[in-house]
């Protein structure tokens, strides 16, 4: 080994990163030139920005399965950039129909074959963009990893790749013998590297010896409001959920400059931007009459497009609750009914790529992701206590009042490159 | 996968009633929202009703009060109980998931007619 590569800087070519295997699409879902009828950013590559647009496909997809298996009155975070990150470490070393379905699953098959061949090179690209951000008031850290059982012996080239392009090597434990300390190991290594804010990721008893391969993503996001809400303007109101009950939410208030629009059927969008401007929440909330089940079902990337693009900066009203949303899951039986069936399955799986020996038996026992979300008048996850001097609030009755009181969509995204970093639904921002 | 299939649908006067079943392939169908959707010819696909994991359910207008759906986790199955038919309710109705939809089945005829 020579010097180490800055994966940030660094170009195809400096990484010989070819996966074991190929996937050429049947039907030819993409070419090179798709995508160029919407006008890239400037400075940014053409392969990391259809990366991003792969992404929101499948985020908005993976949001709506997710969705139909929650209670309305649930709340909903996950980071979608997080979960396809994450398997696309193990697309890397995937083969025959395990690997289809995953370019399937995660939309990667809707992108340029050269974008998708060098993915994870692109994945790199991406993350480098968000993680590395120089703006230091916010900040975006993720864990992601596969931990696999001691007895197999890894591909080195995998390995070498993996600490590369996303940070951690397959890290081997040993489920046979010491199942519940492995657990205790990997929960272990989430908290330390989120700081201590995302705790206990996998659940008791979720491994067991014949565990094999287990994939781990977890992520959280801290920023400041470019225009914060006054502590003293937070009253206690009632928010009306969906069931038609009402609980009392802390709700913050602000008067202030924010590109909003009002979109079909009354639905209200909104844009607050985190300070830096890359980084921005956006919040969807329907009229009073609509249920956000039914926005949730007519939401497509093409439809969250055409709204931002819609949005125009006015003077308006905010009323907006306090929430922590802390959300962890199994992704495995959400993604088998997506379609990712044979990764998961041990007769079925083609990891050759990840194994050493060629052994053809390896398979993911299950995949477990976690992202939390806590929003106060500082911004994001903000503990800090900067003096803030806003004018109290006014009875101005005809300006524009975005009041969210009842159940709504949140979005946070990176602006440029419109990639969604995390999405949501806050249906009870009254649980602690 | 998941394997959706439709039966049930039949010829029937007006007036009339039929049950229609849906067979879902899902690991995570207790918990999962699903819905009944029916077309007819030249027209859009459209939601005729739906229920969720915890047993709530929605209709369209044209249906209420006729149409009741329901399920059976230990069976994996939606059911449409379709009372007091319209010649307006022909059409093949489908089940599949309220937001998200997979492969679409066969579906199955509906036809009132005297």
């Known amino acids: 080994h020579g010097s180490p590569v800055d994966i940030c800087t660094a170009k195809p070519r400096d990484i010989p990163m070819n996966p074991m295997c190929i996937y050429r699409s049947p039907e030819k879902k993409a070419t090179e030139d798709e995508g160029s009828e919407q006008k890239i950013p400037e400075a940014t590559n053409r392969r990391v920005w259809e990366l991003s647009k792969a992404n929101s496909r499948f985020a908005t997809t993976f949001y709506q399965h997710l969705a139909d298996s929650k209670n309305d009155n649930d709340n909903i975070f996950l980071s979608p950039l997080s979960i396809s990150t994450a398997f696309a470490m193990t697309k890397l070393g995937a083969c025959n129909d395990t690997l289809q379905q995953l370019m399937e699953v995660f939309k990667f098959d809707t992108i340029s074959e050269k974008t998708s061949d060098q993915i994870h090179f692109f994945f790199a690209k991406l993350n480098c963009r968000l993680y590395r951000k120089a703006n230091k008031s916010s900040k975006l850290v993720s864990a992601n990893r596969l931990f696999g059982d001691k007895s197999l012996t890894f591909n080195e080239t995998y390995q070498d790749i993996s600490e590369l392009v996303y940070g951690a090597k397959l890290q081997p434990l040993d489920f046979k013998e010491n199942a519940e300390q492995s657990r205790a190991a990997i929960n272990k290594w989430v908290s330390n590297k989120t700081e201590g804010r995302i705790t206990d990721v996998i659940p008791s008893e979720a491994i067991n010896e014949l565990t094999v391969l287990v994939l781990v993503n977890t992520i959280y996001f801290k920023g400041l409001w470019k225009s914060k809400f006054s502590p003293e303007n937070t009253r206690k109101e009632l928010f009306y959920k969906a069931d038609g009950e009402s609980c009392s939410a802390s709700m913050m208030y602000q008067e202030g400059k924010f590109r909003y629009r009002r979109v079909a059927e009354g639905t209200q969008v909104l844009e607050l931007p985190f300070k830096g401007d890359d980084i921005t929440m956006v919040l969807i909330l329907p009229k009073p009459e609509k249920s956000l089940a039914k926005v949730e079902k007519e939401l497509t990337p093409e439809v969250l497009q055409e709204w931002l693009d819609e949005l125009e900066e006015m003077m308006l009203v905010v009323h907006m609750p306090r929430f922590r949303i802390e959300d962890g899951f199994s992704l495995k039986e959400q993604l088998q009914d997506m379609g990712l069936v044979d990764l998961f399955s041990p007769e079925k799986s083609k990891l050759p790529g990840i194994v050493a020996e060629g052994r053809d038996d390896l398979y993911v026992s299950d995949a477990f992701h976690k992202a939390f979300l806590e929003v106060n008048e500082e911004g994001s996850e903000a503990a800090a206590s900067t003096a803030v001097v806003i004018a109290g609030r006014s009875l101005n009755p005809n300006r524009v009042t975005f009041k969210a009181n009842r159940p709504f969509l949140v979005f946070i995204r990176e602006v440029p490159l419109n990639t969604i970093i995390f999405m949501g639904r806050v249906a009870n921002p009254c649980v602690k | 996968q998941v394997q959706l299939q439709e039966s049930g649908g039949g010829l029937v006067q007006p007036g009339g009633s039929l049950r229609l079943s849906c067979a879902a392939s899902?690991?995570?169908?207790?918990?999962?929202?699903w819905a009944w959707y029916r077309q007819a010819p030249g027209k859009q696909r459209e939601l005729v009703a739906s229920?969720?994991?915890?047993?709530?359910?929605n209709y369209a207008d044209s249906v209420k009060g006729r149409f009741t759906i329901s399920r059976d986790n230990a069976k994996n199955t939606v059911y449409l109980q379709m009372n007091s038919l319209k010649p307006e309710d022909t059409a093949v109705h489908y089940c599949?998931?309220?937001?998200?939809?997979?492969?679409w089945g066969q579906g199955t005829q509906v036809t009132v007619s005297s």
């Open positions: 599949n998931g309220y937001r998200y939809t997979y492969a």
């Open positions: 899902a690991l995570t169908f207790s918990s999962r929202a």
């Open positions: 229920i969720t994991g915890g047993g709530t359910t």
